[in-house]
């Protein structure tokens, strides 16, 4: 069964500067990666980046940076300043479409107990939907 | 099949403002970006800048900043495009576009002339 | 910005001939997590919007003719017809897919010799 996973972490340089790193751990052909906060993409999350292997990379504010770290997994630096800055408590979200087996999502948030610049290893968030 | 059909071609003066549509059918409306593209008579492609629909985030080539205001309406499945303080430069058909340039409006033409 | 310079500006070639068009952009479109070359080529006919063609430096669009083809990486890019018909008479764009603002080449213009 394939599975998402999420990792948040706050850098200790910048305390309102998040990065979010997703993968998909999974034989399929990743076509589609949408990364969004404050919910599941769809289900009042707002989407920060989508991300196509091929056709390119879309991000809006606050996202800084979004790439490919690898054929299966993402990440995304957002910036924090102003209104729409992340704090410490919002959850990110990573969806994954692929072929053949469908899309799937998963969140994560800061590691209630992290300090600045460390995080939880990146295990597998748990998986909230499955669109086959 | 993604669909982008535009609104037909103004004349307007310089000073104006002028607002052209992009509807949209046959796709997910608000999960990808539509893009606006510029290109002035016998001239290349020029990028003006995105909004993503569902959350109204945008994006802007610099140099279009204070000339391009992105809005998006999900009821109707319709992007709009504000230009102000139109200049006989900003002639020019405009174009919609969507899924990374995979879709295309048929374009606007725009013309600026006292 | 990323600039794209095509050569030839304008090109000729008899039907049923190989048509190749050049790109080059001043940073690299690769993305070095995934290997892929974000760049992408246009087809432009009178009167008509572009037409996507080949994104990932190589991938034909669906529904493209496969006489279309694209290579190259970093930042050497060309588009290839490999035998040139009637219809394909137009010009070409290529565009930076890679990072904002997305940028196009200043275009080439393909005749029938």
């Known amino acids: 069964t394939p599975e998402v996973w999420v990792q948040v972490r706050m850098e200790a340089t910048e305390l309102s500067s998040f990065t979010i790193r997703c993968g998909f751990l999974g034989s399929g052909s990743i076509s589609l990666v949408t990364v969004s906060w404050g919910g599941p993409n769809g289900a009042g999350g707002t989407t920060l980046a989508v991300l196509h292997p091929e056709r390119g990379i879309r991000q809006w504010a606050p996202a800084r940076q979004a790439r490919w770290e690898t054929q299966s997994s993402i990440s995304l630096i957002l910036e924090g300043s102003g209104a729409s800055s992340p704090c410490a408590n919002t959850t990110f979200c990573c969806k994954f479409a692929s072929f053949p087996e469908g899309s799937w999502e998963a969140c994560g948030s800061l590691p209630p107990s992290s300090d600045p610049g460390l995080s939880a290893p990146p295990t597998p968030a748990p998986i909230l939907r499955a669109d086959l | 099949e993604v669909q982008l059909v535009q609104s037909g071609a103004e004349v307007k003066k310089p000073g104006s403002s002028v607002k052209v549509s992009c509807k949209a059918s046959?796709?997910?409306?608000?999960?990808?970006?539509i893009e606006w593209v510029r290109q002035a008579p016998g001239q290349g492609l020029e990028w003006i800048g995105e909004?993503?629909?569902?959350?109204?985030?945008?994006n802007y080539n610099e140099k279009f900043k204070g000339k391009a205001t992105f809005t998006a309406d999900t009821s109707t499945n319709t992007a709009y495009m504000e230009l102000s303080s139109l200049r006989s430069e900003d002639t020019a058909v405009y174009y919609c576009s969507s899924y990374w340039f995979a879709y295309w409006g048929q374009g606007t033409l725009v013309t600026v002339s006292s | 910005d990323i600039v794209m310079t095509q050569s030839p500006d304008s090109l000729a070639v008899s039907l049923g001939e190989r048509a190749t068009i050049n790109c080059k952009s001043s940073?690299?479109?690769?993305?070095?997590?995934?290997?892929?070359?974000?760049l992408a080529w246009y087809q432009q006919k009178p009167g008509q919007p572009p037409k996507l063609l080949i994104y990932?430096?190589?991938t034909r669009e669906s529904g493209v003719p496969d006489r279309f083809s694209g290579s190259g990486s970093g930042t050497d890019f060309t588009l290839t017809i490999s035998s040139l018909q009637a219809e394909d008479v137009a010009v070409y764009y290529c565009q930076n897919a890679h990072s904002y603002p997305p940028t196009f080449g200043q275009g080439t213009k393909l005749e029938i010799k």
């Open positions: 909004i993503l629909p569902g959350s109204n985030s945008t």
């Open positions: 046959g796709g997910t409306f608000s999960s990808f970006s």
């Open positions: 990932g430096a190589s």
């Open positions: 940073q690299s479109l690769l993305n070095s997590g995934n290997q892929k070359n974000y």
